[in-house]
């Protein structure tokens, strides 16, 4: 039978009264058009609508927008036009909403041409009131608040500008001209590049990368002939041209541009790219595009200071047209990561790291499901999931995959179960152990959502026809009800709950049609009533992450330590609540080899957990590039796996001599940077 | 030559199944998958299904899911399609056709190749 | 599912002359279509795969084009032989689907 229709499927007492008193319908007075929504900080139930509407006149488009504010998290909605004029507000720069709680938004409004600059609206109040401000430039991308003061804006005109406002949008100064790419990194410094001759476009690969650290009183250049550059984690990246000819490597650094290394990864040409897939505080993963229009590369994992890499994935897909890619961090449990790799015959494969991106395996069938006509066989195949590149290719997947980090271990994602990604309609699948093991959720694509903490799992059928039926589950996914929230269908088109999946309360989005208009309505669900009771001590069970051999003294040990959970018990029914804080208790582990990443010039044999040395590099002195010198390694293959805890146990030695010989291939060696005051 | 070779003509009463096979020759049958399309007197054409001759794995059209079964027997090279519950709308020729792509969703670079070798037809009528 | 649609149901062409066939798909099949021949009794036989490649051993007359939704069939001098029903065919998203047939018929 269908996941959800087994007899041993309990049901929830008199949902359909308790869901029914929380049912809020909110009609929209406008004209379907466009609409977008925004959360106003956390817990804080204001949610932003913006409808936009474009009438097209016979010389021209007319357009016609309406702001909406909701503090109940959906419930009921106030229209606050007025508050902002009445004017018509830019959609492609969306609602710039300030960072953690400040209760900044930033509205960009259309203005006639030939005006001076562009117009904004500011709110530092949960939107209760706005402020109308004229700028002295028009802006070319969204406002860009710095992570630590919200205060601090920045944003690139359509004149190639820096505009930076230290008053929350008040007043603007242009910083700097002839600026391509500007970002924030920490403690309020500014990066950007810097075009010379024509624009951003024809100096592609002569840029400069500059750094201002006071918001534009002075300027270091701190990297010359750039193409691009990125920040991810503590670490950042530019790819630099090389002297010779019109291939680029990647430079990195550690202490926001002062000095620089090179990244021991391969140099790309014209055509190919580099890509940061993930970074944290400890690593990176790096994408590096093969060469030609392959549309795959090569996954590489990066050594606690980013330059010495690992080959991690062969194969991975990540197109050159769309830039699509599949690689996904799944957020719900430590080191495990997903991904899609194209295989030889040119079908397209997922596959799974547990160990940040030391070993890929594939997908574990799931239980409940038959293999498909992908399988070579019957009885053994994989689960194959679909993410962005599925959805590129307009396949019939509505979501990419979902984790939170506060539901643990649990993974939500359309799939197939065969030898490779199936263009056929594919079903939903739930992981709730951080995708070891798998289970058919739901029968054909639809919508999902996890609100408190996991405590509840919300889907919707994908559907071209109306619809009025949201379908939930208590249980992770094992039982399904189905509730009809309103009698007239709608043509639905999302839904919204609050980021952080803590909230209880799920909005239906979607728009009515009848024979002379259409207007958008929502339905806001609150479930606090389905959970009627605090969880409790007793609703919590104990449970081992990576735990594949409970008779292993080391089960469970992933980058050197274990971590035990208390988790929500399947059979109870109870708020975990907007506090719930995942309570874990970590534990170290002895060092084995697999707590070693293979050290520059060594690789691992597949099935092997040795490291052995690359046959081309066999005999040679390792050498690598470090802040501009040359350094020479002695190792006997090995190096800790960054953010691996693990003590005692295998120690393999690993030993750098400074050469102190200077490194010709590296570009940004700090003679070449200069500083500079306005 | 590559050919697909189909059984004969079949008569049925509603509500009876009928198997039509189809033997292929001519090329490696496990290197490439096999497509079940029928056409009704006078009306189009409709795809059935999709079978991997490694391993029998299958796909279907919504439509017959429940009621239609496709196997092979690779010491043979021949796939079967059997449809079950049989109503006069399933009054139709069934064509079985070699598939080269299968359904898996391709990379970047690819593109469909076609049903490029098709069976003779089997005639099945539905007729109480 | 993706729905195929051709035009026209009928089209009358003189031998010699050029004859141009539509078909569209409800949403983007990118260059996964093929066009399929089938003349009375007998099976389909395959045209044209990947929108705009020529199967083995058919004749150069033929020709495919387009890419996304729209796309087009077109034989630029018609022989005798080549008065038959003509479907286009999708595998971009599963089930296949065929359109509903163009007969070219003697004018």
């Known amino acids: 039978s269908a996941p959800g229709e087994d007899e041993e499927c309990g049901r929830v007492r008199d949902f359909v009264a308790k869901l029914a008193n929380n049912t809020h319908q909110h009609v929209f007075d406008d004209l379907r058009g466009s609409v977008s929504l925004s959360w106003v900080g956390d817990s804080t139930g204001v949610i932003l609508v913006l409808t936009t509407f474009h009438v097209p006149l016979v010389i021209m488009t007319f357009g016609q927008s309406k702001l909406y504010r909701s503090e109940d998290y959906g419930k009921n909605f106030k229209d606050i036009t007025d508050l902002i004029n009445n004017t018509f507000i830019r959609t492609e720069f969306g609602m710039a909403i300030g960072p953690e709680n400040s209760g900044k938004v930033v509205l960009t409004a259309e203005v006639s041409g030939g005006s001076r600059g562009g117009r904004i609206f500011r709110s530092s109040d949960f939107a209760k009131n706005f402020v109308q401000t004229d700028l002295p430039f028009h802006p070319l991308t969204q406002m860009m608040y710095s992570p630590q003061n919200s205060d601090y804006l920045l944003a690139l005109s359509t004149e190639n500008g820096l505009w930076v406002s230290k008053n929350f949008g008040g007043k603007w100064e242009e910083i700097h001209k002839a600026v391509c790419l500007a970002k924030w990194g920490s403690d309020n410094t500014i990066f950007f590049t810097t075009y010379a001759n024509g624009s951003c476009k024809a100096d592609l690969g002569a840029l400069e990368l500059w750094r201002t650290s006071d918001l534009g009183k002075s300027f270091k250049t701190i990297g010359v002939k750039i193409y691009s550059f990125g920040l991810g984690g503590r670490f950042l990246f530019a790819s630099v041209m090389a002297d010779k000819d019109t291939t680029r490597r990647i430079h990195v650094s550690t202490d926001q541009g002062d000095t620089w290394s090179m990244a021991q990864l391969p140099s790309v040409g014209q055509e190919q790219f580099y890509s940061i897939l993930a970074a944290n505080d400890d690593m990176v993963f790096m994408h590096v595009d093969e060469p030609g229009d392959t549309g795959f590369g090569t996954i590489f994992t990066s050594d606690d200071r980013g330059i010495v890499y690992s080959k991690s994935l062969d194969r991975h897909l990540y197109t050159t047209t769309g830039g699509e890619t599949d690689f996904t961090n799944v957020t719900s449990l430590r080191g495990v990561y997903i991904t899609s790799v194209l295989s030889e015959d040119n079908s397209i494969q997922t596959m799974i790291t547990f160990d940040q991106g030391g070993r890929w395996t594939h997908l574990r069938k799931p239980e409940n499901s038959e293999c498909d006509a992908t399988a070579k066989n019957k009885n053994e195949c994989s689960l194959h999931i679909h993410a962005s590149y599925s959805i590129s290719q307009k396949l019939n997947v509505p979501m990419a995959p979902l984790s939170e980090p506060n539901a643990v271990g649990i993974v939500i994602a359309h799939g197939s179960v065969g030898d490779a990604i199936s263009v056929m309609v594919p079903d939903v699948y739930i992981s709730d152990d951080g995708g070891y093991s798998w289970t058919k959720m739901l029968e054909g694509p639809h919508y999902y959502t996890i609100l408190d903490s996991g405590g509840i799992i919300v889907a919707i059928e994908h559907s071209s026809r109306p619809i009025n039926v949201i379908k939930f589950s208590t249980d992770e996914g094992q039982c399904w009800q189905t509730y009809t929230f309103t009698r007239d269908p709608i043509y639905f088109t999302g839904l919204a709950s609050e980021p952080g999946a803590r909230s209880m309360n799920i909005s239906i989005w979607g728009f009515t049609e009848s024979f002379l208009t259409s207007q958008w309505v929502s339905y806001t669900i609150d479930f606090k009533d389905i959970l009627e009771r605090n969880c409790e001590e007793k609703d919590y069970t104990i449970w081992l992450a990576h735990s594949t051999d409970p008779e292993d003294y080391e089960d469970g040990c992933i980058l050197g330590y274990k971590e035990q959970f208390l988790r929500l018990r399947k059979s109870s029914v109870c708020q975990n609540g907007r506090d719930y804080v995942v309570t874990k208790q970590p534990s170290i582990c002895l060092c084995s080899l697999e707590d070693f990443l293979c050290d520059f010039g060594y690789y691992r044999p597949e099935n092997d957990s040795k490291c052995v040395e690359q046959p081309e590099l066999k005999g040679h002195d390792l050498e690598f590039c470090l802040y501009g010198r040359e350094e020479h390694l002695t190792t006997n293959g090995y190096r800790k796996i960054p953010g691996d805890k693990c003590q005692g146990g295998v120690n393999p030695v690993r030993e750098v001599k400074d050469l102190k010989k200077k490194c010709t291939s590296n570009f940004l060696s700090p003679e070449k940077q200069n500083s500079k005051s306005n | 030559q590559v050919q697909l070779v189909q059984s004969g003509a079949e008569v049925k009463k509603p509500g009876a199944s009928v198997k039509v096979s189809c033997k292929a020759s001519?090329?490696?049958?496990?290197?490439?998958?096999m497509s079940w399309v029928r056409q009704a007197p006078g009306q189009g054409l409709e795809w059935m299904g999709i079978i991997n001759p490694i391993g029998g794995s299958t796909s279907y059209a919504q439509k017959f899911q429940g009621r239609v079964t496709m196997t092979r027997d690779t010491s043979t090279s021949t796939v079967y399609m059997e449809l079950s519950s049989l109503r006069s709308e399933d009054t139709a020729v069934y064509y079985c056709a070699r598939d080269p792509s299968g359904i898996a969703l391709a990379g970047p670079a690819s593109r469909y190749y076609g049903m490029d070798v098709w069976g003779q037809g089997t005639t099945v009528t539905v007729s109480s | 599912e993706i729905v195929m649609t051709q035009s026209p149901a009928t089209l009358s062409v003189s031998p010699g002359e050029r004859a141009t066939l539509s078909c569209r798909a409800s949403q983007s099949v990118s260059s996964n279509l093929a066009w399929y021949q089938q003349k009375p009794g007998q099976a389909p036989r395959l045209l044209i795969y990947?929108?705009?490649t020529r199967a083995t051993g058919i004749p150069a007359r033929f020709s495919g084009s387009g890419s996304g939704t729209e796309f087009t069939l077109t034989i630029s001098s018609l022989q005798s032989e080549d008065f038959a029903v003509y479907y286009c065919?999708?595998?971009?998203?599963?089930?296949?689907?065929f359109g509903g047939g163009t007969k070219v018929e003697i004018k």
């Open positions: 990947g929108a705009s």
């Open positions: 065919q999708q595998a971009r998203l599963g089930p296949w689907t």
């Open positions: 001519g090329y490696t049958f496990t290197k490439y998958y």
